[in-house]
């Protein structure tokens, strides 16, 4: 309507404050100065907005800023945030972590919304690099950030930010993240003693290779069945009952309820029913004694 | 401890009027907006009214505006309703409601007090 | 803006899965709160932004929904759900009230 688009006598913003509160779409519109909008955003979260007038909010800021945002307004954006799209977002160009924390902290107890993904995507593009300090303030609030990344982007994480990870932000990493992620937990942690050094390293086995387990198995880690079970196939495959069975150490009787299952099922196969004897678990589907055990892969290697 | 408690609810007769109050404590009372939302006998809830944090604003639902009051003495930490005019349709209980600090869903509420319309 | 609830009451045993659905007259975003109230008891806030958990509510407690069609979930019913549930939008005023859900136990 007309008459609605000049703003009332008296109505004038002067300042971002309470006394906004019950305008209509139309007074927001006509009565508050985008530019005074802009310099006082950090005044809008302390003020409860309807929806509808967020949107009227956010419709200023998309006009005056029409190329994105600023980071002096983003930073402030607060709960304005939630009404931002991904291609909002594609337009910004954040580079504090102060500016990323705050606006993490308005989506918290949501779920990683594509606003946040694009941001995070954003802020990480922008840095080069997922650094120490990002990766902390990122698995805070998503703990399961880390998996969520593809394997090549994992290749960006510098082993300085592996200590950064907690156990839980690698639960629905798959085997192939894990392959990226452990050796770069490997090179972080090479400088700590034995014991030390397999809690911390524990939680990226799911990416060691043979010879790795070997070396853990002449150090009594007392690995878990957990743990052992996340191990991959192939490096677990050429174990043998001795190395397996110092590898677990006192855990080694948890075998038995594991034996239908990968990588414990696959491992007994290649294993001599002799040896699975020797563990006294009661273990079969070993090889039978007096049977030749032929390595085609190595014969192949040969010729 | 923080807590909302009313007062002030009775029996009145139509065309009378009643003042309702709302004791807060245990939060910043100034620094939030406040409502009041009723619940006639046995039905669902309604919005009334609601106030800015320093009381410079205010909001009434349509069908009260004209007839009820709302206001707060920030220094006292209360929130009143001055109901006039009052209608059999106005008989409700009447809960005092704190506002989340930057969005309009009500996190903190009263016991309620019960008014009665009737001749 | 209207908000209809449903079913107005439903009766379910312990244990059971619950869902309760609310929709909006226009779309609200994800405006939308959810609330719990017993008998002579004051509504208490459950959900809020549509499917962020209030703090301090089990986590059998769920919200879901954009738009105008909203979900409270109640994923294994205990003794003291057995109550009425409110939803409420605010995404513009006035603000509004569905008109309840009754849990009874069946």
């Known amino acids: 309507e007309v008459e609605k688009t000049a703003c009332p006598s008296g109505k004038k913003a002067r300042e971002i404050d309470e006394s906004l509160i019950f305008y209509k779409k139309w007074e927001l519109e006509a009565c508050v100065d985008a530019a005074l909008l802009a310099t006082q955003m950090d005044r809008v979260n302390a003020i409860p907005f309807t929806y509808e007038q967020l949107d009227v909010l956010k419709h200023k800021l998309d006009e005056l800023y029409p190329q994105g945002y600023p980071e002096s307004v983003i930073q402030h954006l607060g709960y304005l945030f939630l009404k931002m799209s991904p291609e909002d977002i594609r337009k910004w160009n954040v580079t504090s972590l102060e500016t990323l924390k705050a606006l993490l902290e308005v989506n918290k107890g949501h779920e990683m919304s594509p606003q946040v993904a694009t941001l995070i995507d954003r802020f990480v593009k922008g840095r080069g690099q997922l650094d120490k300090d990002t990766l902390d303030t990122l698995t805070a609030f998503y703990p399961g950030y880390l998996c969520s990344l593809s394997p090549e982007e994992l290749s960006s994480v510098p082993p300085s930010s592996i200590w950064a990870v907690r156990p839980q932000d690698l639960d629905t990493c798959d085997p192939r993240q894990l392959d990226v992620l452990y050796p770069k937990a490997r090179l972080a942690f090479q400088n700590m003693n034995g014991s030390e050094y397999f809690v911390k390293i524990q939680s990226f086995l799911g990416g060691a290779p043979t010879e790795d387990l070997k070396a853990l198995s002449q150090q009594n880690v007392s690995m878990d069945l957990a743990t052992f079970m996340k191990l991959r196939t192939d490096a677990v495959l050429p174990l043998t009952v001795a190395e397996v069975q110092k590898l677990l150490g006192p855990h080694v009787e948890g075998l038995k309820a594991e034996e239908r299952h990968r990588p414990v099922r696959d491992w007994i196969l290649r294993q001599r029913q002799d040896d699975l004897d020797t563990l006294g678990l009661g273990l079969q589907g070993g090889i039978p004694n007096g049977y030749l055990v032929l390595d085609l892969s190595m014969q192949e290697a040969l010729s | 401890e923080v807590q909302l408690l009313e007062s002030g609810g009775g029996l009145v007769q139509p065309g009378g009027s009643l003042r309702l109050s709302c004791a807060a404590s245990g939060f910043t009372f100034s620094s939030y907006a406040m409502s009041w939302v009723r619940q006639a006998p046995g039905k669902g809830l309604e919005w009334v009214s609601a106030i800015s944090g320093s009381g410079g604003s205010t909001y009434y639902a349509d069908s009260v505006k004209g007839r009820f009051t709302i206001s707060r003495d920030n220094s006292k930490n209360t929130l009143y309703l001055q109901m006039n005019s009052l209608r059999a349709e106005d008989t409700a209980v009447y809960y005092c409601?704190?506002?989340?600090?930057?969005?309009?869903?009500?996190?903190?509420w009263g016991r309620g007090t019960l008014v009665t319309v009737s001749s | 803006i209207q908000l209809t609830q449903s079913p107005s009451s439903l009766s379910a045993s312990v244990g059971d899965r619950v869902t309760i659905t609310c929709r909006a007259s226009?779309?609200?975003?994800?405006?939308l709160a959810w609330y719990q109230q017993k008998p002579g008891k004051a509504p208490k806030l459950l959900i809020y932004d549509a499917s962020s958990l209030e703090s301090g509510v089990p986590s059998r407690f769920s919200g879901s929904g954009s738009g105008t069609d909203f979900t409270l979930t109640i994923s294994s019913l205990q003794p003291e759900d057995f109550a009425t549930y409110y939803c409420?939008?605010?995404?513009?005023?006035?603000?509004?009230f569905g008109g309840g859900t009754k849990v009874e136990i069946k």
């Open positions: 226009q779309g609200i975003s994800s405006a």
């Open positions: 409601a704190k506002v989340f600090a930057n969005s309009w869903y009500f996190d903190l």
């Open positions: 409420q939008q605010f995404n513009n005023y006035p603000l509004t």
